[in-house]
């Protein structure tokens, strides 16, 4: 995934004993929060693997790249990064692996330049619908985000709320239409069973969509038609059995698309005929000759591209009177 990187060469560290001396005054230009490393030259602050339980209040105003990975933040409250003066330069924020289980409405407000946000590897049991939009208005101010990385944010099953995890994530993506400018969205490794049908239509600027390593069985109700800028669609390591005509036509109609379909348990029966025909003709599928049948057993391990219509049969369904128990 594309998380913010830094070319920081000279980092200054502040001594841990300063931790209790958090000033309400605006931070000095060269001040570095306790337990962090700072490089003004690289406009980068790293507070990594320090078991922080809250976002440091005294972040330097120059920060452009902020790494808060490997901490124990638990909750990201509203205005977690709101400062006076605001962190007007902050463009890349990485919060991955910081044990966040709740992100509240308006958590990223007052970050006018925030383009990249990585919340991966946090068990987000409670992601507010207004986490990214900041308000519950039907149309919010546009978010500056162009890249949102949400890989492996599914909490353990026993910690999930009594609601659809897919629905919770999608609500946050669609609230207030704030993410209309989003170009990269990564949702890998989240145990998604389905993709709510309205989600993609409302993210028209997407260039890169990663849905790999989920449990998607079908794309029947998902429309890619509006994603005219889409360049890469990662669907590897799901539970897809077949792609139907409607999906195939929509994918073929996207001018810049590359689709990744490895490691799906393709069922090579009569329903696969259209997909096989399409695969033989299309150039959009990367590594298409690696796609192999998983079922039925007699077809297992066969290369999809080498199948012909005679190979693809469905066992006849016996009328009830002929079925045996």
């Amino acid at each position: 995934s594309s998380s913010p990187t830094s070319s920081a060469s000279s980092f200054s560290s502040s001594a841990p004993f300063l931790a209790s001396a958090v000033s309400a005054q605006p931070p000095l230009p060269d001040q570095c929060p306790a337990l962090c490393e700072c490089s003004e030259a690289a406009r980068t602050v790293k507070c990594v693997n320090r078991n922080l339980t809250e976002v440091p209040t005294d972040l330097p105003a120059y920060v452009r790249n902020l790494f808060l990975t490997g901490n124990q933040l638990a909750v990201l409250p509203a205005g977690a990064f709101a400062r006076r003066p605001p962190l007007a330069e902050l463009a890349a924020l990485n919060l991955s692996g910081s044990r966040l289980d709740e992100v509240r409405a308006g958590a990223f407000e007052h970050l006018p330049s925030l383009r990249q946000l990585d919340l991966s590897h946090n068990p987000l049991a409670d992601l507010s619908p207004f986490a990214f939009s900041g308000s519950n208005a039907s149309v919010s101010a546009p978010s500056p985000l162009v890249e949102l990385i949400l890989n492996h944010i599914v909490p353990p099953e026993d910690e999930r709320q009594n609601r659809s995890f897919e629905g919770m994530v999608v609500a946050a993506l669609l609230a207030g239409r704030a993410l209309q400018g989003l170009r990269r969205l990564e949702l890998a490794s989240n145990h998604f069973l389905y993709l709510p049908r309205d989600v993609l239509a409302q993210l028209p600027s997407l260039r890169h969509l990663d849905l790999s390593n989920n449990s998607l069985v079908s794309l029947t109700y998902v429309s890619f038609r509006n994603l005219t800028h889409l360049e890469s669609l990662h669907l590897e390591d799901n539970a897809l059995k077949v792609l139907h005509n409607g999906t195939l036509a929509e994918l073929q109609g996207l001018p810049h698309i590359r689709v990744f379909l490895d490691n799906n348990p393709w069922v090579c029966d009569c329903h696969m005929a259209d997909m096989v025909t399409w695969l033989k003709e299309t150039e959009v599928v990367q590594g298409k000759d690696r796609l192999t049948c998983a079922y039925p057993e007699k077809m297992r391990n066969r290369v999809l591209l080498e199948l012909n219509s005679a190979d693809l049969d469905c066992d006849p369904i016996l009328p009830p009177s002929l079925q045996t128990s």
Partner: antibody, heavy 116, light 107 residues
Framework: QVQLQQPGTELVKPGASVKLSCKAS????????MHWVKQRPEQGLEWIGN????????NYNENFKSQATLTVDKSSSTAYMQLSSLTSEDSAVYYC?????????WGQGTTLTVSS | QVVLTQSPAIMSASPGEKVTMTCSAS?????IHWYQQRSGTSPKRWIY???KLTSGVPVRFSGSGSGTSYSLTISSMEAEDAATYYC??????????FGGGTKLEIR
């Protein structure tokens, strides 16, 4: 029935090359990827690489990229693996195996001995 | 790349005894396959997709597991079951990896 036939033994000198063969029968050769697996004496199984007989596309384990070359002859339904710059470390049994998700049929293996 | 760790490396069982061996993955995998290799012969696919027995495999064998933890069980050990068993991760793209093997001996 599906069969993958391999020569029993090959004896070569250090520094030399060898080309191992695997003749397939009982199925459509071009419809399945062919894999090669190495097993040193009393050791486990190590995947070397695979080839799509239909188009010749190959994938290699990084550890074997510079040493192994996989090819096929569609007319005789035979897969080949050439190993170059051989040392005693390459003495092992080499299996071909038909596969995709798993390896459903295996050859009997060729025992390669590298010795001067 | 997923690393598969099998345990124990060597075990022995008496005829009629129940046998369980495990395969642990370094990260979550969808399914595991098992291969049996008797001494001096090539491996045979024994169990695929975690729990499906290859045709001809005795029903005393079973496979189970999910995520990172998988196992192969023999309900009642027989002499012909003495072999080395290897697990392999479910994938159709490179690289394919195997566990180090569990050698099962008859006591």
């Amino acid at each position: 029935q599906v069969q993958l036939q391999q020569p029993g033994t090959e004896l070569v000198k250090p520094g030399a090359s060898v080309k191992l063969s695997c003749k397939a029968s009982g199925y459509t050769f071009t419809s399945y990827w062919m894999h090669w697996v190495k097993q040193r004496p009393e050791q486990g199984l190590e995947w070397i690489g695979n080839i799509n007989p239909s188009n010749g596309n190959t994938n290699y384990n990084e550890n074997f990229k510079s040493q192994a070359t996989l090819t096929v002859d569609k007319s005789s339904s035979t897969a080949y693996m050439q190993l170059s710059s051989l040392t005693s470390e390459d003495s092992a049994v080499y299996y071909c195996a038909r596969g995709g998700w798993d390896f459903d049929y295996w050859g009997q293996g060729t025992t390669l001995t590298v010795s001067s | 790349q997923v690393v598969l760790t099998q345990s124990p490396a060597i075990m022995s069982a008496s005829p009629g005894e129940k046998v369980t061996m495990t395969c642990s993955a370094s990260s979550s995998v969808r399914y595991i396959h098992w291969y049996q290799q008797r001494s001096g012969t090539s491996p045979k696919r024994w169990i695929y997709d975690t729990s499906k027995l290859t045709s001809g495999v005795p029903v005393r064998f079973s496979g189970s597991g999910s995520g990172t933890s998988y196992s192969l069980t023999i309900s009642s050990m027989e002499a012909e079951d003495a072999a080395t068993y290897y697990c392999q991760q479910w994938t159709s793209k490179p690289p394919w990896t195997f566990g180090g093997g569990t050698k099962l001996e008859i006591r």
